[in-house]
């Protein structure tokens, strides 16, 4: 806390400039106007203080609005931003795409703080769900960003903002997370067609369910082994060779190599030995021949 | 034959909530997306969201978001749709409605419920 | 937000052709569907995906879709084709429906 003392003669600041960085701290509190400064909020940024100087700053934008700050003054925050705690961003009410992009920029380069996981929420939230505007721009500054959200919050987002996913934001995710965002693809992709669905839709396959694997595999689709092997093990097991053949076409000789690894490994010991025989890449473990198979599965449904 | 069966008229006061159920009979072992789409007396049809067959996903129309909950007991094959915040102006008969049609872009409504009434009055 | 506009009624004879048009910005590029309600029933879909018929729906209903423009045609229309007709389709983030044709068979 800076002590109350008074301006200096001749101190008095009249604007937000250069000379400001030789005023000690407790002369920045007694000559700066905080109304000058939250007028003049653009200017700072520009100015080389040190990080005491804008603790004091910061202090006296926080006399002047103990609510919180008001949008115009947040929009010029610039480095300012990083000296303000999760607590005083939740007093903020930010609508502007832009003032967002502004202080996303100022922590650009560095993991997502918790300041600026905050200032998204409260965008978000203010917002009413997650457009494909604001998520154009989390995505371009934090790609992990989607992923970092619960399945929950994933619900909030509609399917026209799925245009703006590009496949490296979905790295991070895992299958309840594509489980949300899957059948919101199938929503934002439906007026497709064919190859130009499946391009878009590849990304989001590890949420598919085995009925939407089937629909596909009579598409000529060509699924590499990449794809494949994110798909969810439980909806990969009820494909039959033939369905597996189909969805792969040419790939499907890059299942010997993955035979060992789930979902394939999986899904070999559920298949007759004879039917993967007739694939002809010598992957073994399937039911012998005489064998029979009791789908349990459906007599747990049936009772 | 597939029917969509979808429980009984309410009346409510404003302010309150409803929530309609919509169970499936027939070829349950399959799960839909299901549609809820609502008509007010004497007007057109108005969607309301939609949710995935598993039930984790829903997308609703901009118009009910945050006032309006889909959610789905796939051990009994019902949909359910609540309604907050009732007004009069949400008196309507509401609709469920599925997407049963073969093909990955299909999701016109081919199979519809008998229609709830919903009553808001004071 | 994104409208389907009809044309609020639609006369015919019995035995002669129906269209009912829907028009949207760019619905050419949706795929469109067409309900057909009768007073005090749940709708019936007629087309979906432009043109095509789910099964049991008679061959005299079909449809088209081009530029802004969908269609339904109803040939050699039938007394029990008397109705209200909505399109439908995806606008990005919601399916809409069109604002209704009653079809009057004269």
């Known amino acids: 806390e800076v002590e109350k003392t008074a301006c200096p003669s001749g101190k008095k600041a009249r604007e937000i400039d250069e000379s400001l960085i030789f005023y000690k701290k407790w002369e920045l509190e007694a000559c700066v106007d905080a109304a000058l400064l939250a007028t003049q909020m653009d200017r700072v940024n520009a100015i080389p203080f040190t990080y005491e100087q804008l603790d004091v700053l910061k202090h006296k934008l926080d006399e002047l609005y103990p609510q919180g700050y008001p949008e115009s003054v947040i929009q010029h925050l610039g480095y300012l931003f990083l000296k303000m705690s999760p607590e005083d961003i939740r007093k903020w009410n930010v609508t502007s795409l832009e003032t967002l992009k502004a202080l996303l920029e100022v922590n650009k380069g560095h993991e997502m703080s918790p300041q600026v996981a905050t200032l998204i929420d409260r965008f978000v939230k203010g917002r009413g769900q997650l457009d494909k505007d604001t998520l154009d721009t989390l995505t371009a500054f934090y790609p992990g960003y989607l992923c970092s959200l619960s399945p929950e919050e994933l619900s909030s987002v509609p399917p026209s903002s799925i245009w703006a996913v590009r496949p490296q934001d979905l790295d991070t995710c895992d299958p309840r997370q594509l489980d949300v965002l899957y059948p919101k693809a199938r929503l934002a992709f439906q007026n497709m067609n064919g190859s130009e669905y499946f391009v878009k839709i590849q990304s989001f396959l590890g949420g598919a369910p085995t009925e939407d694997l089937k629909a596909l595999s009579q598409q000529n689709v060509s699924m590499d082994l990449a794809t494949f092997m994110k798909l969810r093990t439980d909806a990969v097991l009820p494909l039959t060779v033939a369905e597996v053949q189909k969805l792969l076409g040419p790939h499907v000789e890059g299942l010997k190599a993955e035979e060992r690894h789930r979902p394939v490994r999986d899904w070999i010991l559920r298949q007759r030995q004879d039917d993967l025989d007739t694939l002809g890449l010598g992957l073994q473990g399937g039911i012998p021949n005489g064998y029979l198979v009791l789908d349990l599965s459906m007599q747990e449904a049936l009772s | 034959e597939v029917q969509l069966v979808q429980s009984g008229a309410e009346v409510k006061k404003p302010g309150a909530s409803v929530k309609v159920s919509c169970k499936a009979s027939?070829?349950?072992?399959?799960?839909?997306?299901a549609h809820w789409v609502r008509q007010a007396p004497g007007q057109g049809l108005e969607w309301m969201g939609i949710?995935?067959?598993?039930?984790?996903?829903?997308t609703y129309a901009q118009k009910f978001q945050g006032r309006v909950t889909m959610t789905r007991d796939t051990s009994t094959s019902t949909v359910y749709m609540e309604l907050s915040s009732l007004r009069s102006e949400d008196t309507a008969v509401y609709y469920c409605?599925?997407?049963?049609?073969?093909?990955?872009?299909?999701?016109?409504?081919?199979?519809w419920g008998q229609g709830t009434l919903v009553t808001v009055s004071s | 937000s994104y409208e389907l506009t009809q044309p609020p009624s639609v006369s015919v004879s019995p035995g002669q052709t129906a269209s009912i048009t829907c028009s949207g910005d760019?619905?050419?590029?949706?795929?469109g569907s067409w309900y057909q309600q009768k007073p005090g029933q749940s709708p019936v879909l007629v087309i979906y995906?432009?043109?095509r018929r789910p099964s049991g729906i008679p061959e005299r209903f079909s449809g088209s879709n081009s530029g802004n423009t969908a269609t339904l045609t109803i040939s050699g229309t039938q007394a029990m084709d008397e109705a209200d007709y909505y399109c439908?389709?995806?606008?990005?983030?919601?399916?809409?429906f069109g604002t209704g044709t009653k079809v009057t068979v004269l």
């Open positions: 409605a599925e997407s049963r049609l073969p093909g990955y872009n299909a999701f016109a409504m081919d199979v």
């Open positions: 027939g070829d349950t072992f399959k799960r839909y997306y």
């Open positions: 949710i995935n067959p598993s039930g984790v996903s829903t």
């Open positions: 760019m619905l050419g590029y949706q795929y």
């Open positions: 995906q432009d043109n």
């Open positions: 439908q389709a995806w606008d990005g983030d919601a399916f809409v």
